[in-house]
């Protein structure tokens, strides 16, 4: 290690951040590049092919210049130096500009969401106070699974207006607890749309829909596909009658046969009278035999 070589050799003092610096040894970079110069010319760093370890030197210089965290003017131009930052570094930042966020997400494009990116997004969203539409647009463009990575508590800060930015694929990995939070927001966001347009928009969120909303949809000839039906909450599907399910699914009702062993279809069949199931003509088995009395125990509990 050449730690003792701290003085900058004659004629090597950097006047600007340029390509000549790629030929400097690490100790020469340390000795010959002024941190303030680096900070003011950060936009040049990304265009210069510094090595992995040369970047460590540049980062160290910035860390010494800004021990409390980098200003946004520097952060915006970090480029691939961002890949050298730790979550601890990023927690010191105050990122308020969407352009800065985009610039840093671009650096990580095509890779999994790293701990650094997750921390950056967390800092940005917390700074804004809510997940607004422009931010959500940006984040889901880079990470389609972003929304489903948030906890139900974090999702509660999403304003209904932001829901317009959500695409069906953004919800692919969401679990029922997340959809429980998102569905009411979507219902509010799309409330002024007409029947068929409303259904197209709300369909991806229906995993959070209560029974009464499913009953209402069944009256609107929506022809829900089986994939959507299979994602509905079991507790929301169970109270639906055979007639309601038939109306809800329309021509897709035939798909119930293939799914009769899977939730929520299996549990729903167990709650229906076999007579009623037979009216579908699909050969669904497992309903309540004719002549049996059905006791609604949930109602009994509510009365006691």
């Amino acid at each position: 290690r050449e730690v003792e070589k701290t003085a900058c050799p004659s004629g090597k003092k950097a006047r600007e951040i340029d390509e000549s610096l790629i030929f400097y040894k690490k100790w020469e970079l340390e000795a010959c590049v002024d941190a303030a110069l680096l900070a003011t010319q950060m936009d040049r760093v990304n265009a210069i092919p510094f090595t992995y370890e040369q970047l460590d030197v540049l980062k160290h210089k910035l860390d010494e210049l800004y021990p409390q965290g980098y200003p946004e003017s520097v952060i915006q131009h970090l480029g691939y130096l961002f890949l050298k930052m730790s979550p601890e570094d990023i927690r010191k930042w105050n990122v308020t500009s969407l352009e800065t966020l985009k610039a840093l997400l671009e650096v990580n494009k095509g890779h999994e969401m790293s701990p650094q990116v997750a921390t950056l997004i967390d800092r940005f969203v917390k700074g804004r106070g809510q997940l607004d539409k422009d931010t959500l647009d940006t984040l889901t463009a880079f990470y389609p699974g972003y929304l489903c990575s948030l906890s139900p508590e974090e999702l509660s800060s999403v304003p209904p207006s932001s829901i317009w930015a959500v695409r069906p694929q953004d919800l692919d990995t969401c679990d029922p607890r997340q959809l429980d939070v998102l569905y009411p927001k979507a219902r509010l966001a799309f409330q002024n749309m007409n029947g068929s347009e409303y259904f197209v928009k709300i369909q991806s969120f229906l995993g959070g829909a209560p029974t009464e909303d499913l009953k209402a949809l069944s009256q609107q000839n929506v022809s829900m596909d089986l994939a959507t039906f299979m994602k509905l909450r079991t507790d929301a599907v169970l109270p639906l009658t055979v007639a309601e399910v038939q109306k809800l699914l329309g021509p897709h009702v035939e798909g119930l046969k293939a799914e009769e062993r899977h939730r929520p279809v299996r549990d729903w069949i167990l709650r229906q009278r076999q007579d009623d199931l037979d009216t579908l003509g699909l050969g669904l088995q497992g309903g309540i035999p004719n002549g049996y009395l059905v006791l609604d125990l949930s109602m009994q509990e509510a009365l006691s």
């Epitope: 790629i22 400097y24 092919p49 090595t51 691939y80």
Partner: nanobody, 119 residues
Framework: QVQLVESGGGLVQAGGSLRLSCAAS????????MAWFRQAPGKEREIVAV????????YYAESVKGRFTISRDNPKNTVYLQMNSLKPEDTAVYYC????????????WGQGTQVTVSS
């Protein structure tokens, strides 16, 4: 250790093109900067082109700017040099090099591939 093997050199007429390849083995070079150097008979070895570890930025010697293009394929551990509009003065042995530190220290080198441009 990183082993570098160059290929693609040969004899070409002035104005022609060649594409050099450099395959790295021994360890992944995804965090290494890669470069092409060249050495003409009786001259010092000089840098031709550099590409950084992300593939996002490059450097070219003035003499090859606009004619040569360096690129890399990290999953394949390979770096390329596309050489167009070749001139007799491009005749040299071309070496592939890799470093995580700087080009003046801790640099791995290939054996070289001969490029000859006839007029």
């Amino acid at each position: 250790q990183v082993q570098l093997v160059e290929s693609g050199g040969g004899l070409v007429q002035a104005g022609g093109s060649l594409r050099l390849s450099c395959a790295a083995s021994g360890r992944t070079v995804s965090t290494y900067n890669m470069a092409w150097f060249r050495q003409a008979p009786g001259k010092e070895r000089e840098i031709v082109a550099v590409i950084n570890w992300t593939g996002g930025s490059t450097y070219y010697a003035e003499s090859v700017k606009g004619r040569f293009t360096i690129s890399r394929d990290n999953p394949k551990n390979t770096v390329y040099l596309q050489m167009n509009s070749l001139k007799p003065e491009d005749t040299a042995v071309y070496y592939c090099a890799a470093t995580r530190t700087s080009w003046t220290e801790n640099t791995y080198w290939g054996q070289g591939t001969q490029v000859t441009v006839s007029s």
